[in-house]
Interface confidence: medium
């Protein structure tokens, strides 16, 4: 892995097994298989993993043994293609098995499903979970990896090992506690929420690499690492970017063993060189490997060096701007991005990338002009509106959030986004708008200097969820346009969308607004989702409904649910009062 490629290992599978150790090797192979074959039963995957592990051990013993020289893609792909029910379960994905590597792996990757048709994970009683944990800890933890990986086919594999370690620690501690539930449930809730966030963040990284290419990912990484490590030199940041890009390219490409191995190497490099990277790494670097890598990924921004010179000197006033740009465009733009980002931890990464794009466009135009310097002299003035737009948007939305609270703020966004893109499926609109609404409690509490990086970069992650879900079944040209034209302008693109005047309102269907007594036993969150689903449907039926009209109907709906859940004969109440509610709502909305 040097600057010069060493002789390749005789057996790649033996090399990775030795580097990672048996436990991590097995866990990563299970994650890889579950992310590819998302519908296969747990037992089938465990069997495949055990077969691969036994084979790897023979290669460790003798790297020259038969098939040990095959690539990991060949070995894993061959193993996946032995699944007997491939055609029945996965349909056309079975055609991948007729292809040769590397086309076969690409084919498997294309069939990863961001929204697989799998039952929701229901959490058993605490005693049931603790018994299962004690009866067979290994199987219990493998099941966790399997269930998460198949539902999140782009989950960052080495990070999932970290989650599994915390999951195990939670059960180890809490199953011995006096009040098991009080100990365990908050920990599981925290892991679930963090896991969803981690999955969504990684999904954006993979989308960036796969849809917009390595250059886009590297630009993102330069900006983010320069904010985080402002004391590091450009060459050091560049090296970290190259290494990080390799790690994420591997994980997004299904090369999970290589990814985990290289991530460990990168953590080692960062900790060995922390003096030239950041003063904030000391605590992270004292932790064990999985915690260390996670800690580094989340580490706070280092302090900015004092007395950084003005950017204008090198990037506007210098006579060599066009010469330097022409010499090595990406290196020069990388230096610009590095210098700008290390000075602006208060900007979102996507804003920094918009500024760099504006700078690049200006140089492209001006370096071909008669008087380049005159042409690009005012380039920094063009940045002002780009900076003010997210600042103003965040200010307005934080004010709205503080006024409404999270649930009603989510509802405002539900209405806003349903009017923008009413063709999108109701579950997707509910999921995405609820997540967009969480930006309030996540970011509005921060001081001004931290609001924008928190809010806009979080919104990029959430809007990517919309983009990947919509890509599976495209229904809106407007969504496709905002998702595909520019990665860094997705949020401004969606913000700029007005009500879709071409939308033909959905036919009214009373069944959509028929509720039953089961709503009473739901958790508060589930009840909110039911109400928000109804709200989206209302807007789809009546896109021109005013805020006041919708509020009146939703208030009636809340009162109806509360009344019937207190009734002795709940089901009869829901049936009779429900009819009245539907009629009243139709009248209120003029349907």
């Amino acid at each position: 892995r040097g600057v010069f490629r060493r002789d390749a290992h005789k057996s790649e599978v033996a090399h990775r097994f030795k580097d990672l150790g048996e436990e991590n090797f097995k866990a990563l192979v299970l994650i890889a298989f579950a992310q590819y074959l998302q519908q296969c039963p747990f037992e089938d995957h465990v069997k495949l993993v055990n077969e691969v592990t036994e084979f790897a051990k023979t290669c460790v013993a003798d790297e020259s043994a038969e098939n040990c020289d095959k690539s990991l893609h060949t070995l894993f792909g061959d193993k996946l293609c032995t699944v007997a029910t491939l055609r029945e379960t996965y349909g056309e994905m079975a055609d991948c098995c007729a292809k040769q590597e590397p086309e076969r792996n690409e084919c498997f990757l294309q069939h990863k499903d961001d929204n697989p048709n799998l039952p929701r994970l229901v959490r058993p009683e605490v005693d049931v979970m603790c018994t299962a944990f004690h009866d067979n800890e290994e199987t219990f933890l493998k099941k966790y990896l399997y269930e998460i990986a198949r539902r999140h086919p782009y989950f960052y594999a080495p990070e999932l090992l970290f989650f599994a370690k915390r999951y195990k620690a939670a059960f180890t501690e809490c199953c011995q506690a006096a009040d098991k539930a009080a100990c365990l449930l908050p920990k599981l809730d925290e892991l679930r929420d963090e896991g969803k966030a981690s999955s969504a963040k990684q999904r954006l990284k993979c989308a960036s690499l796969q849809k917009f290419g390595e250059r886009a990912f590297k630009a993102w990484a330069v900006a983010r690492l320069s904010q985080r490590f402002p004391k590091a030199e450009f060459a050091e940041v560049s090296k970290l970017v190259t290494d990080l890009t390799k790690v994420h390219t591997e994980c997004c490409h299904g090369d999970l063993l290589e990814c985990a191995d290289d991530r460990a190497d990168l953590a080692k490099y960062i900790c060995e060189n922390q003096d030239s990277i950041s003063s904030k790494l000391k605590e992270c670097c004292e932790k064990p490997l999985l915690e260390k890598s996670h800690c580094i990924a989340e580490v706070e921004n280092d302090e900015m060096p004092a007395d950084l010179p003005s950017l204008a000197a090198d990037f506007v006033e210098s006579k060599d701007v066009c010469k330097n740009y022409a010499e090595a465009k990406d290196v020069f733009l990388g230096m610009f991005l590095y210098e700008y980002a290390r000075r602006h931890p208060d900007y979102s990464v996507v804003l920094l990338l918009r500024l760099a794009k504006t700078y690049e466009t200006t140089l492209e135009k001006c370096c071909a002009a008669a008087d380049p310097h005159e042409c690009y002299a005012k380039v920094f003035d063009e940045f002002k509106p780009l900076v003010e737009e997210p600042q103003n948007l965040i200010k307005q939305n934080c004010e709205l959030f503080e006024q409404l609270g999270e649930y009603k703020f989510q509802n405002a966004l539900l209405v806003r986004y349903t009017k923008k893109v009413p063709q999108v499926s109701t579950p997707t609109l509910v999921e995405v708008s609820r997540n967009l609404g969480k930006v309030g409690s996540k970011c509005c509490k921060h001081p001004e200097a931290k609001r924008m990086p928190c809010a806009e970069d979080y919104l990029s992650v959430v809007l990517n969820q919309l983009c990947v879900l919509h890509e599976k079944t495209p229904v809106s040209d407007r969504v496709t346009k905002c998702c595909t034209e520019s990665l860094v302008n997705r949020r401004p693109c969606f913000s700029a969308l007005e009500v879709d005047e071409t939308y033909v309102p959905k036919e009214f269907n009373a069944e959509t607004f028929t509720f039953h007594a089961d709503i009473c036993t739901l958790s508060e969150k589930e009840r909110q989702i039911k109400k928000q689903t109804a709200l989206v449907e209302l807007v789809k039926h009546k896109p021109k409904a005013t805020k006041e009209q919708l509020k009146a109907v939703m208030d009636d709906f809340a009162a109806f649910v509360e009344k019937c859940c207190k009734a002795d004969d709940k089901e009869t109440c829901f049936a009779e009062e429900g009819k009245k509610l539907v009629a009243a709502s139709q009248a209120a909305l003029g349907l």
Partner: nanobody, 126 residues
Framework: EVQLVESGGGLVQAGDSLRLSCAAS????????MAWFRQAPGKEREFVAG????????RYIDSVKGRFTISRDNAKSTMYLQMNSLKPEDTAVYYC???????????????????WGQGTQVTVSS
């Protein structure tokens, strides 16, 4: 981090030849571009020649084109600079550099390189 060590410098007459070597040890992850830079007394360090990972792309400054040849042997982790028809103005300390590999291959910009050797002195007398 990667370590680079240059060798092969020395004192020669104008018109003679020299072959510089740059041996790499340690590691970095990616396929790196590599280059030779030089710094003459009282002058700034300047790019001389660069080569990409696969040796497919090489580039030179105009003043050495046709006289210098850059090459690399990945199996030996070594890069070379064959210098023929040396001139007094080639006198300088020659540095070997390993690039960060993102952006232009074998860039002429110093900032594109993350690892540097200590340098080897080349003196050409007339």
């Amino acid at each position: 981090e990667v370590q680079l060590v240059e060798s092969g410098g020395g004192l020669v007459q104008a018109g003679d030849s020299l072959r510089l070597s740059c041996a790499a040890s340690g590691r970095t992850y990616s396929r790196n571009a590599m280059a030779w830079f030089r710094q003459a007394p009282g002058k700034e360090r300047e790019f001389v020649a660069g080569i990409d990972w696969s040796s497919e792309n090489t580039r030179y400054i105009d003043s050495v084109k046709g006289r210098f040849t850059i090459s690399r042997d990945n199996a030996k982790s070594t890069m070379y600079l064959q210098m023929n028809s040396l001139k007094p103005e080639d006198t300088a300390v020659y540095y070997c550099a390993a690039g960060t590999s993102w952006g232009a291959l074998a860039s002429r910009l110093e900032a594109a390189y993350s690892s540097w050797g200590q340098g080897t002195q080349v003196t050409v007398s007339s």
